[in-house]
Interface confidence: low
Amino acid sequence: GITIPRNPGCPNSEDKNFPRTVMVNLNIHNRNTNTNPKRSSDYYNRSTSPWNLHRNEDPERYPSVIWEAKCRHLGCINADGNVDYHMNSVPIQQEILVLRREPPHCPNSFRLEKILVSVGCTCVTPIVHHVA
Amino acid sequence: GITIPRNPGCPNSEDKNFPRTVMVNLNIHNRNTNTNPKRSSDYYNRSTSPWNLHRNEDPERYPSVIWEAKCRHLGCINADGNVDYHMNSVPIQQEILVLRREPPHCPNSFRLEKILVSVGCTCVTPIVHHVA
């Protein structure tokens, strides 16, 4: 494979903790300024597997606020607007990276953490288990 | 609001770049070891708004591999297994944090970046615009 040469302008990495501990610039390069999912689209309401968005806040985490989707129904909404239990509303989950303050309450020291969040819901055909 | 006292064991923060630059431990605390979304569930295939998962790789980003969902159809799959264009398959998007190597190719210096990824698809009732 291609080896990319190390940039000579990199910060010094001779710290005894390297490469576990790295420097991170928190000035976020943000390509999307709309962080409230309720404003970004109304899919959560128009979906055949609609969901509610719950605010999850944790001051020891960055980002401190994460929105979690909870499916409104076990079934899906059919053409008549009724819940059809022959289909299932299920959460679509995504693994995301967050920063966890470590040691706790430190303003400038973090540890990477992977958490699983539900982003929205989709309508699926149920798996039917036939009893022999 | 409540002011949490600073932990006396925090690293020194008298760097001229503070608080923009912080120390991050890359030893991930991972509550979920399954990072391939195709293995985590087969919803992408069973959904009425099925999607394909595309591998997006960037060695200058951490994580370097991100899976992007692309809806297979404009419409949704109906009970007969056909695409119904009276409904729309739409991507559910999520803003996630990634680390971008900065300066480029540096092994131990990053900048936080927010990117929008499509996690999966859901079936929605279209917004119908009636022409006057």
């Epitope: 390509r31 999307n32 709309n34 970004s40 | 992007e68 809806c71 404009l74 998007q93 929008l116």
Partner: antibody, heavy 118, light 110 residues
Amino acid sequence: EVQLLESGGGLVQPGGSLRLSCAASGFTFSSYAMSWVRQAPGKGLEWVSAISGSGGSTYYADSVKGRFTISRDNSKNTLYLQMNSLRAEDTAVYYCARDLIWGVAGSWGQGTMVTVSS
Amino acid sequence: NFMLTQPHSVSESPGKTVTISCTRSSGSLANYYVQWYQQRPGSAPTIVIFANNQRPSGVPDRFSGSIDSSSNSASLTISRLKTEDEADYYCQSYNHKDIVFGGGTKLTVL
């Protein structure tokens, strides 16, 4: 009725800059990804750039990467294309288009002409 | 990146049927939708087929689209040709980061 009206075209010297705008009406602008497509005189269509409904994701053709920037202001129902370091080969009619989904331009504006010449 | 190849021109008489082909150079055509756009002289393009074979409302059923996975190609068929069908036709497809148009086919209705 979906309406897309491009503006901002004109004559510019090589190396110069221009900002195109596309005013949208007749639909919920923030719900749709948008694209710019261009057509050089007597030539075929060439995709230039695309942006997601929220503005969070942007995509560019290799031929314009690093020189052009697509953006949108959903509060003004307006799509933009900032074009820097313009070259003679950027001369074309620039169309803005509303995407049905990624890669499907459902509705088009009438276009605005950009001429890069000394 | 991939390319979409179309014939430069085709011609046919009114009332007849004409087919325009579009071949994808790399990557499975079946994995991504193919669209067809009509562009009359001096006008902006309009979509006549999306999602391989779907017609937007207002497009006559004389227009149809299909794909052939074995040859990695798509086709636009126009039956019962009319003089107003004379135009340039562009196929278009995409992958996860690029949108590509074919070079265009000039249809002449004799």
